[in-house]
């Protein structure tokens, strides 16, 4: 509530706004009859410097002139850019207990003169928009700086707008609020920006433009697509544009794509036919416009139209495989399997599959539709059977794929040779083979088929397979390959009416098994011991078991045990050994071996043979 400058005045020379690097003199003068009562000679004027409301310096030592009791002049130097506050206070030295009294204050602004504005750019958004220009102001001046944008054109057209920059706002764009119309298309316009502050002024170079240079059309709107006769590959894209647009750019892509298809359309008048679309595919469409074929700017891209193209009937052929097993004395069960079409072949949502099993000679035909990718039927074991499958969507069905049902492993002469399986990495296996040696009919193709060596449902866990051309002798299998699981792999060689196959086991990664086989019984028959066991549970095998080892040693013996190594066969669960002495108690146990090493031992069993030894 105090009148801060009641006691005196503060003045600045040369001015309260100074260029960076300049010094200033600040004079503090007491008004008549103001000051310390009774003792004018005890008046002491001090000057305090504040930056951002924080006291940073007492300029007592910067006095350059002192009129005792009436005025003091202080020189200030090295002022930083921006505003600095100086406050003059009166200190009555005879009264040590009273704080100094404010006399008056002054703000000094340190800045620079404006640089000439550069890079002027003007735009008018749409035919009915207004001209707005932006520029680069150059270095910050730290002072309030006024900018004036002036436009001049034909027919004595002049227009100007102003704005200012200070420490709270920046002025580098102005909308003139005028509209340039297409009838001025050939006319030239000049704009200039002038900057002025307390330390100087500057002007930009004149910037000349035409209507076409600065008018950016509005992006097209109301985009839609019409598919001709519900076609999935042909459609007419339609949109609304400003009246003067002569050129459009269209871009479109499937939603999961990373590259756009680009099309330029001249005088399209809001309509363009697309002929290369993929059926049943989510697309994104965008359009941009230009007012002139050679000059002018493209509009921003329109908002995206996202839509799915209609379905078309499936193309391509299904990849079919089958499994057959004798079900009783005169019937066999045929399980057909097929792979789903990829989206570019399905060209729609597959509603069902049409399956046909036909006996060639008797013309018996079994037909059915299924939504699954497998189908099982029991048929007579006699006769030559063929199967076909086609996929159907709402627009139609694919051409049926045919396969002859032959005994897949029936012809030894067609069995591929030297089949091997090598683990390539964690999730694939390289299978190689040599062609059949004495095939009496040409190999049309190889099928590499694999199944996990784990119990599974025949229909719920279909086989995995790859079709290989007849001149290839290797396949990298990766579908559904998991580490630490053993797979049985079959390589089939197929001719027109016969099949031969060879099997091998393989894994993509292996560890030593978790445990050894469990010995369930030891029996003595005709001077031989038969060891019976249960196999290691599948999850504990951790890869393909190569062989089992049966160990034995005399009870309480510290000697190394003897061992017998047996090739692993899943169908085998007992083995004879014949080198044990009668009436000696032995301890027996078993281990299992994968390519990674040997398991810990299984359970121990004691046995004392009774019969005559070898």
């Amino acid at each position: 509530n105090i009148d801060v400058c009641k006691l005196g005045t503060v003045t600045v020379q040369p001015a309260p706004v100074i260029p960076l690097g300049s010094a200033a003199n600040i004079s503090c003068s007491l008004n008549p009859k103001q000051g310390c009562s009774h003792y004018p000679s005890s008046n002491e004027l001090i000057l305090l410097k504040f930056v951002n409301d924080v006291l940073v310096e007492n300029l007592h030592g910067k006095k350059v002139h002192d009129h005792t009791g009436h005025s003091s002049t202080f020189q200030v130097t090295n002022l930083s850019l921006g505003m600095t506050l100086f406050v003059c206070k009166l200190n009555c030295s005879n009264s040590q207990k009273k704080p100094p009294v404010p006399v008056c204050g002054v703000e000094i602004s340190v800045g620079v003169a404006p640089e000439p504005p550069q890079n002027i750019s003007c735009v008018q958004e749409g035919e009915n928009g207004t001209v707005a220009c932006s520029w680069n102001s150059g270095k910050v001046t730290y002072l309030k700086t006024n900018y004036t944008l002036q436009l001049s054109g034909p027919n004595n057209l002049t227009c100007q707008k102003q704005c200012f920059s200070d420490n709270r706002q920046n002025c580098n764009r102005l909308d003139l609020g005028i509209n340039l119309s297409p009838d001025l298309a050939e006319s030239r316009f000049i704009v200039r920006v002038t900057a002025i502050n307390d330390l100087g002024n500057s002007s930009s170079l004149p910037h000349t433009f035409t209507f076409l240079d600065i008018v950016i059309p509005l992006p097209p709107w109301d985009i839609r697509i019409n598919f001709l006769n519900a076609s999935g590959s042909r459609g007419t894209l339609q949109w609304e544009d400003e009246g003067q647009v002569v050129l459009n750019q269209l871009r479109y892509q499937p939603l999961n794509s990373t590259s756009w298809n680009m099309v330029n359309a001249t005088n399209a008048k809001g309509k363009y036919d697309l002929r290369d679309l993929r059926p049943f595919t989510e697309y994104e469409f965008q359009i941009s416009s230009k007012l002139h074929l050679s000059g002018g700017s493209w509009s921003n891209w329109s908002e995206s139209l996202r839509t799915r193209t209609p379905e078309e009937e499936p193309v391509g052929i299904l990849d079919i495989w089958y499994m057959k097993q004798d079900i009783d004395y005169d019937r066999q069960q045929i399980s057909l399997f097929w792979k789903s079409l990829n989206p570019s072949e399905a060209r729609g949502k597959i509603l069902h599959y049409q399956v046909t099993l036909q006996e060639v000679t008797k013309k018996t035909t079994l037909q059915n539709t299924t939504r699954h990718t497998s189908w099982t039927r029991v048929i007579p074991r006699t006769g030559a059977w063929t199967a076909s499958v086609s996929a159907a969507n709402s627009k139609g069905a694919s051409a049926p794929t045919h396969i002859n049902i032959v005994d897949l492993c029936g012809t030894g002469l067609l069995a591929p040779h030297q089949v091997s399986a090598k683990s390539e990495n964690m999730d694939n296996i390289l299978v190689t083979w040599q062609p059949p040696k004495k095939a009496d009919s040409a190999v049309r193709e190889y099928i590499v088929e694999w199944r996990a060596l784990q119990p599974g449902s025949i229909t719920k866990f279909p086989p995995h397979w790859l079709r290989i051309p007849p001149d290839n002798m290797s396949a990298l299998i990766s579908e559904n390959i998991k580490p630490y699981i053993c797979y049985e792999i079959r390589v089939h060689a197929l001719s027109e009416s016969q099949g031969g196959c060879s099997s091998i086991r393989g894994d993509s990664k292996h560890k030593a098994p978790v445990s050894g086989p469990h010995i369930t019984a030891i029996t003595e028959k005709k001077e031989r011991l038969f060891i019976s066991w249960t196999h290691i549970p599948f999850p504990e095998q951790r890869g393909c078991i190569l062989h089992y080892r049966i160990y034995w040693k005399e009870r309480d013996s510290t000697a190394q045990p003897e061992l017998c190594e047996i090739q692993y066969r899943r169908s085998q669960n007992s083995h004879p050994i014949s080198s044990l002495q009668p009436r000696v108690t032995y301890v027996l146990w078993m281990t299992a071996v994968t390519a990674a090493g040997e398991s810990p031992q299984g359970n121990e069993r004691e046995f004392c043979p009774q019969g005559k030894a070898n």
Partner: nanobody, 119 residues
Framework: QVQLQESGGGLVQPGGSLRLSCTAS????????MYWYRQAPGKQREFVAY???????NYLDSVNGRFTISRDNAKNSVYLQMNSLKPEDTAVYYC?????????????WGQGTQVTVSS
Amino acid sequence: QVQLQESGGGLVQPGGSLRLSCTASGSIFAIDDMYWYRQAPGKQREFVAYITATNSANYLDSVNGRFTISRDNAKNSVYLQMNSLKPEDTAVYYCNAKQIVGFQIDEYWGQGTQVTVSS
């Protein structure tokens, strides 16, 4: 191992009905494909019907339309509803389960239940 137990057989007049049941126990986590077979005196065992994991069923031609196979997964059971029975349906009926390990098919059989169709 998998154990299968049939029940529901008996003596029935021609044109009558019976419902056979088969309950599985043991390591049945991969048993999805279930079958009924039968063996008449002096004849070979023959397939009657099966049901797959996806409930797809198939029948011997001579029983198609009269017999219906179904399953109740919660009870680990499979059933054979036999209607319009004929004397030639007289046989021991066996429940069968198949599973595949690699390319080898493992089969499990029940003890059988006698069905006699006679007036």
